[in-house]
């Protein structure tokens, strides 16, 4: 009897949908695996007789519940199927946006770039998929614990009237208000402000 794959799960970030599993202990030799997806009531092969423990399902439609399954094989024997269901638009993890930060005197000027999507045109981003897409920004003075959060209305934001000659750190994430779903934070970007631009009268 061939044991089934273990710890079968979908790892999906920005619609890069990778079905992953672990190979069970099997004394007779090396196992191979076949992964399939349900399409119009028929299971179709996606990865056949692979020695890998993952299979790329990024070409699935973003909408709807998909049934995926994987089994282990050895010679003419095979394990039972292990099934999972997956709805990309609901289940994919929203990866961190890109961010450009520029210091202008005592201000930080930020521009946000929505995450790109696997198997899509360069310009079709997560912002196109989710109508309610917005950004959360948090910033703090480097070396302090107090963080401030803002929700920009656009793809850019300016933090004004900051303390001069002070290092501020900023990070951004995508947020979907209608789903109350937050994405992953970007890596912090830390920049030092320069002088206060106000001119004494």
């Amino acid at each position: 009897m061939v044991p089934p794959p273990e710890n079968v799960r979908m790892n999906s970030v920005n619609f890069k949908n990778i079905l992953q599993w672990e190979s069970p202990a099997f004394a007779k030799g090396n196992l191979t695996f076949t992964a399939q997806y349900l399409s119009y009531r028929i299971f179709q092969d996606k990865c056949m007789n692979t020695t890998l423990t993952e299979c790329d399902f990024s070409s699935l439609s973003k909408y709807g519940d998909h049934t995926l399954r994987v089994r282990a094989e050895f010679a003419d024997e095979h394990s039972d199927w292990v099934n999972i269901t997956f709805c990309p638009v609901d289940d994919t993890i929203i990866g961190p946006p890109g961010m450009q930060v520029e210091v202008l005197a005592d201000s930080l000027h930020m521009r946000f770039l929505a995450p790109k999507i696997e198997n899509e045109y360069e310009t079709w981003t997560m912002k196109n998929v989710y109508n309610s897409w917005t950004y959360n920004v948090q910033y703090w003075k480097n070396g302090t614990d107090e963080k401030f959060q803002i929700t920009p209305q656009y793809d850019f934001e300016v933090l004004r009237n900051l303390e001069p000659w002070t290092t501020y750190c900023v990070q951004v994430r995508g947020f979907l208000p209608d789903r109350n779903k937050a994405g992953e934070w970007s890596e912090p970007v830390c920049e030092q402000t320069t002088h206060d631009e106000t001119v004494p009268s």
């Epitope: 909408y63 310009t123 196109n128 109508n131």
Partner: nanobody
């Protein structure tokens, strides 16, 4: 059942232009995303361009960027693909597709309704 009808294909010399049209028979083309795809002889389906209704944003495959322009005329319920500077490698059957949910642009899996296609041949 939505019926998409493409027209405007034909034979054109390299460097020439064509304008493809996509209309919905008896229906409005009121879908979040309309896309154009193509299939060259012996090859798979390839995304060419799409237009999003909500933002009227347009998106293109690298191979056609700067040469093709997608547009929509809501009053005529028609989406157009203006193809300029045509090359031999643009020879294919061109399909129009409509998406109910508008979540994707390039992947055929994200489209629900398809036309029958129109042949474009670029040859001297």
């Amino acid at each position: 059942e939505v019926q998409l009808v493409e027209s405007g294909g034909g034979l054109v010399q390299p460097g020439g232009s064509l304008r493809l049209s996509c209309a919905a028979s008896g229906n409005s083309l009121d879908y979040p995303t309309i896309g154009w795809f193509r299939q060259a002889p012996g090859k798979g389906l390839e995304g060419v361009s799409c237009i999003s209704a909500s933002e009227a944003s347009t998106h293109y495959a690298d191979a056609v960027k700067g040469r093709f322009t997608i547009s929509r005329d809501n009053s005529k319920n028609t989406v157009y693909l203006q193809m300029n500077s045509l090359r031999a490698e643009d020879t294919a059957v061109y399909y129009c597709a409509a998406s109910l949910w508008g979540l994707g642009c390039k992947s055929e899996a994200d489209y629900d309704y398809w036309g029958q296609g129109t042949q474009v041949t670029v040859s001297s």
